[in-house]
Interface confidence: medium
Amino acid sequence: KLTIESTPFNVAEGKEVLLLVHNLPQHLFGYSWYKGERVDGNRQIIGYVIGTQQATPGPAYSGREIIYPNASLLIQNIIQNDTGFYTLHVIKSDLVNEEATGQFRVYPELPKPSISSNNSKPVEDKDAVAFTCEPETQDATYLWWVNNQSLPVSPRLQLSNGNRTLTLFNVTRNDTASYKCETQNPVSARRSDSVILNVLYGPDAPTISPLNTSYRSGENLNLSCHAASNPPAQYSWFVNGTFQQSTQELFIPNITVNNSGSYTCQAHNSDTGLNRTTVTTITVYAEPPKPFITSNNSNPVEDEDAVALTCEPEIQNTTYLWWVNNQSLPVSPRLQLSNDNRTLTLLSVTRNDVGPYECGIQNELSVDHSDPVILNVLYGPDDPTISPSYTYYRPGVNLSLSCHAASNPPAQYSWLIDGNIQQHTQELFISNITEKNSGLYTCQANNSASGHSRTTVKTITVSAELPKPSISSNNSKPVEDKDAVAFTCEPEAQNTTYLWWVNGQSLPVSPRLQLSNGNRTLTLFNVTRNDARAYVCGIQNSVSANRSDPVTLDVLYGPDTPIISPPDSSYLSGANLNLSCHSASNPSPQYSWRINGIPQQHTQVLFIAKITPNNNGTYACFVSNLATGRNNSIVKSITVSASGTSPGLSAGA
């Protein structure tokens, strides 16, 4: 199918466009181009006859068009009026016509824009500023840039007038920035030079430095004042309401007690017409005053906050001292003193940091102590504890659970049963319980000051039947003559009797066996290898009884002094030497041999074939138990005689 492609589709004024023909039929007589969407003789641009290769201009020909043998049309030096549709009329050799239409759009090359402003010196929090991007251009898109970034989202920024105008309402000093506008159309994009917005602001409340307000008689007083302001502020000083001087700094040498008073700095901005003042009270002491402690945080949160305690007043060339709990400061990475010792910082306070804290000022004769300060450290809640610890109850009894969690301020408590909130109390009471009251009981402790909360979940079973108990142990592999083992019969149940059996027998009487915790806990002190037995616990009430599975105690012991066998120590030359070493030990020990102090193999059995008198010497067996960390050894002397020299000698193995 015959089609027209415009290259490019969007054309800049003064440039050229090619109307490119695709799928031109073969065996053509000629073709003709028309302005518009249809064939109209009055709007013919140019015609072309193939046989004669003759191009004939039409009424709409402007002298800027060139037709090519492939029917494509080039239009040069494009003007705005050229925008629109163009129709190609093709006449085939069989005089059958075919038409196709293409189009392009013409846009002007944009000039470099500029920004106009309705207010060159706006006042902070008072004025609005409207920037307008010039010139106004048809079919152009307007964009804005602040510090070369696209516009931030802000309710104080508003675009209007087709984005040509950018309005900043209630300007602030932070609006002081580089503003640029950009114009775009399909054929060009231009950016303006930047305009810097100069926002008048301030003065803010002035700051007087240094901050210390206490001085000794004879020192120099040198105060400096600063207030954020545009343009920069003009400064005036007043002492006790009386004007002193119009400078940023106030200097009074060799001050006396009479220089005590209120010192006022006034900052003035001539453009905004605003004044702001700050007053500091200066105290000049003849003698050091009684110190006092100030804190930057009266209610610090445990493990979160740091607290800075400062010894007041600040006095030049003074020694500051600190005490905690009536002792000098302990060495701790969490305690830091400032260079002048005036500020004590507690990093990451804990509940143990409450104090009391005292500071002191040392003078020539004595040390003046401050009053003690106690910190109110907010902490917790810790994991709550639910008591009593019973998990099994019989139907018909009353269930009374109490929850407690360490917390400052004291925790607020809530109870949930199976995830459902019940009540906001520290105690939960349910009378005459049934099996239906079995479930997950959750206590939630909340600290309103820190916002932290912690929960503990307890499983309550209400049943006439007792469960099968189990034994928990605090030490699964105790070492002989060293460790104690505590067996506990689980679970803890109300109105229940606990019983114990060892190897199927009731407990033997022994000072090393002790029952505690209502017979629920059986402790074996200084375990021995003979305690490696099967332990069973039982629970019973008036309705039922049940026994646990046996738990066998695995006592680690040894190695005992080893025994070398056979016991013979005299051998005949030519015999085989076969020594075996054994030591009682749990777990089994590791064995090694030494002959005359020289290490041999790491085996339980030492074998030497056809010994000679050269094999005389000391044979040592070493045993070690890695689990108990203990070692042992034995030494045996072996004598090898030449054959037949002495009666009664062993012939060897």
Partner: antibody, heavy 124, light 110 residues
Framework: EVQLQQSGAELVRSGASVKMSCTAS????????MHWVKQRPEQGLEWIGW????????EYAPKFQGKATMTTDTSSNTAYLQLSSLTSEDTAVYYC?????????????????WGAGTTVAVSS | DIVLTQSPASLTVSLGLRATISCRAS??????????MHWYQQRPGQPPKLLIY???NLQSGVPARFSGSGSGTDFTLNIHPVEEEDAATYYC????????FGGGTKLEIK
């Protein structure tokens, strides 16, 4: 023997309500929470809610709030489930169940006694 | 709500071999020394039947070839050796809060 006997299948028009029953034998329903579970054709199980027959306390899964109403009649040892404003989404088998007597480990929420189910078909 | 995700959705196991079904919870269902996860078997046209309660306890009358394990968020049902009558859909269910069921795993025997 502990058993739950459920009422027969129901064919109901869209928009109507249906009430099915679950009668316990071998135990007193006052001693247990009674639960209802829904199973749509070829689908999984959805817990609807529980009722404590002793005092009428109920708790519903959020999805079934306003759709299902559980009641009991302790004199006949029977639990009931009523479904309102029925749509095709309510076509399912509805089971009643409870924590039976076979274990004494604590928890209200596992179900070792089940009814055979009541089939509800909603027609438009 | 705690969401339970079962995998796989379906499973084919040869007679006598092991079948393993997993159930993952969107948050921990263990508390106070118990894991509040239970397993059910449902054959076509029948109500579900409790197999395992509290993660690993075998319900009375259930064959010992069924076993459960896991804690926190990850739980497993094992059947070994698989028998023909084990062809069914298996569901996990938690009871840490208001109960929800897993989507089910269909076990087929070949």
């Amino acid at each position: 023997e502990v058993q739950l006997q459920q009422s027969g299948a129901e064919l109901v028009r869209s928009g109507a309500s249906v009430k099915m029953s679950c009668t316990a034998s071998g135990f007193n329903i006052k001693d247990y929470y009674m639960h209802w579970v829904k199973q749509r054709p070829e689908q999984g199980l959805e817990w609807i809610g529980w009722i404590d027959p002793e005092n009428g306390d109920t708790e519903y899964a959020p999805k079934f709030q306003g759709k299902a109403t559980m009641t009991t009649d302790t004199s006949s040892n029977t639990a009931y489930l009523q479904l309102s404003s029925l749509t095709s989404e309510d076509t399912a088998v509805y089971y009643c169940n409870t924590r039976g007597l076979s274990t004494m480990i604590t928890t209200r929420w596992f179900f070792d006694v089940w009814g055979a189910g009541t089939t509800v078909a909603v027609s438009s | 709500d705690i969401v339970l995700t079962q995998s796989p959705a379906s499973l084919t196991v040869s007679l006598g071999l092991r079948a393993t079904i997993s159930c993952r919870a969107s948050k921990s269902v263990s508390a106070s020394g118990y894991s509040y996860m239970h397993w059910y078997q449902q054959r076509p046209g029948q109500p579900p039947k409790l197999l395992i309660y509290l993660a690993s306890n075998l319900q009375s009358g259930v064959p010992a070839r069924f076993s459960g394990s896991g804690s926190g968020t990850d739980f497993t049902l094992n059947i070994h050796p698989v028998e023909e009558e084990d062809a069914a859909t298996y569901y996990c269910q938690h009871s840490r809060e208001l109960p929800t069921f897993g989507g089910g795993t269909k076990l087929e025997i070949k």
